[in-house]
């Protein structure tokens, strides 16, 4: 014999306390499948999360963090603080990277610097607390008679298209 | 929009059965329950039964037992009450509802008169 | 079968008053899942009958915010803050979580 449940769609659920009727699911409330027995209880995006998607009768709400905080876990189920470029969050809060690290992001931690001499390359631009090291050419590659070196291109400025 | 719209006034003799049709639209029929509800005049609403979404499965009042049918056609998204053996008490005028809500009627057809005269 | 009993049968209120109609049911109308199984209908003069209020307080769409739905258990009240002329008609209470479902027997409002 059929489960009488199993006709029930997504938005419903078999309500045994009325003689199995798919009843709609009450507010607040979803079911992502059907022949659901109950309807799952929506997300609710408080605090520091807000709504990305609301909830519907077939699916969840959806979060993500207000400005200044960045979503952590799957579906977003922390919120951690922002810290600025060239800082990491600690449980102090955030603090600056120590000297010979560096974080480009306003999340994450603090990374050392590129080591450009374990590659046999020299520093071409120094570290700094928000960008790593740049490494250049070896120095064996500079030096005379060597193929000479393609300086970079220089660097268009933003909104303009190459001619 | 979503809207019930159902079959025009019917004139039985008692002894006979009167079948009422109630066209969904706006909205998919085998998702949301239909029931039937009554008005006698001059009498509270009288709920009959309902049909189930997707399964067509019913559920009938105590009151009508063995003289209501519920039906429906699903590619018509069309919902049916047929009464049997039809008596003056039975006088009325008949609604469609759609559970739109949990455990609420939110959309309701325009209503059937039947008149039961010999 | 659970009984629907309505007070006041008639309820006759001034434009811009508040009114308040009572349905009392004889067994509680809890369901499991927390909410009350109770529907406030509006039926005006010549039309079919119209959603107001349904899990007790949850105002339907399109509803003017002057209805509202408050009560728990057995014991449910319908309020209007500010009856408009709009409003007239039969006022139902119905129980949709036991079959037989069930209707008060009505509350007529009118205007003074």
């Known amino acids: 014999l059929q489960d009488p449940c199993s006709n029930c769609p997504a938005g419903t659920f078999c309500d045994n306390n009325r003689n199995q009727i798919c009843s709609p699911c009450p507010p607040n409330s979803f079911s992502s499948a059907g022949g659901q027995r109950t309807c799952d209880i929506c997300r609710q995006c408080k605090g520091v999360f807000r709504t990305r998607k609301e909830c519907s009768s077939t699916s969840n709400a959806e979060c993500d963090c207000t400005p200044g905080f960045h979503c952590l876990g799957a579906g977003c189920s922390m919120c951690e603080q922002d810290c600025k470029q060239g800082q990491e969050l600690t449980k102090k809060g955030c603090k600056d990277c120590c000297f010979g690290t560096f974080n480009d992001q306003k999340r994450g931690i603090c990374r050392p610097w590129t080591n450009c001499s374990l590659d046999g390359k020299s520093v071409l631009v120094n570290g700094t607390k928000e960008r790593d090291v740049v490494c250049g050419p070896s120095p064996a590659d500079l030096s005379p008679g060597a193929s000479s070196v393609t300086p970079p291109a220089p660097a268009r400025e933003p909104g303009h298209s190459p001619q | 929009q979503v809207q019930l719209v159902q079959s025009g006034a019917e004139v039985k003799k008692p002894g006979a059965s009167v079948k009422v049709s109630c066209k969904a639209s706006?909205?998919?029929?085998?998702?949301?329950?239909m029931h039937w509800v009554r008005q006698a005049p001059g009498q509270r609403l009288e709920w009959m039964g309902w049909?189930?979404?997707?399964?067509?499965?019913?559920k009938y009042s105590q009151d009508f037992q063995g003289r209501v049918s519920i039906t429906r056609d699903t590619s018509a998204s069309t919902a049916y009450m047929e009464l049997s053996s039809l008596k003056s008490e039975d006088m009325a005028i008949y609604y469609c509802?759609?559970?739109?809500?949990?455990?609420?009627?939110?959309?309701w057809g325009q209503g059937t008169v039947v008149t039961v005269s010999s | 079968d659970i009984v629907m009993t309505q007070s006041p049968l008639s309820l006759p209120v001034t434009p811009g008053e508040p009114a308040s109609i009572s349905c009392r049911s004889s067994?509680?109308?809890?369901?499991?899942?927390?909410?009350?199984?109770l529907g406030w209908y509006l039926q005006k003069p010549g039309q079919s009958p119209q959603l107001l209020i349904y899990?007790?307080?949850h105002r339907a769409s399109g509803v003017p915010d002057r209805f509202s739905g408050s009560g728990s258990g057995t014991d449910f009240t319908l309020k209007i803050s500010r009856v408009e002329a709009e409003d007239v008609g039969v006022y139902y209470c119905?129980?949709?979580?036991?079959?037989?479902?069930?209707f008060g027997q009505g509350t007529k409002l009118e205007i003074k």
């Open positions: 706006g909205y998919t029929f085998t998702n949301y329950p």
């Open positions: 119905m129980q949709p979580l036991q079959i037989p479902y069930t």
């Open positions: 067994q509680r109308l809890l369901h499991s899942n927390g909410f009350n199984y």
């Open positions: 509802a759609r559970e739109g809500v949990a455990g609420a009627f939110d959309i």
């Open positions: 049909s189930n979404a997707g399964s067509g499965n019913t």
């Open positions: 899990l007790g307080s």
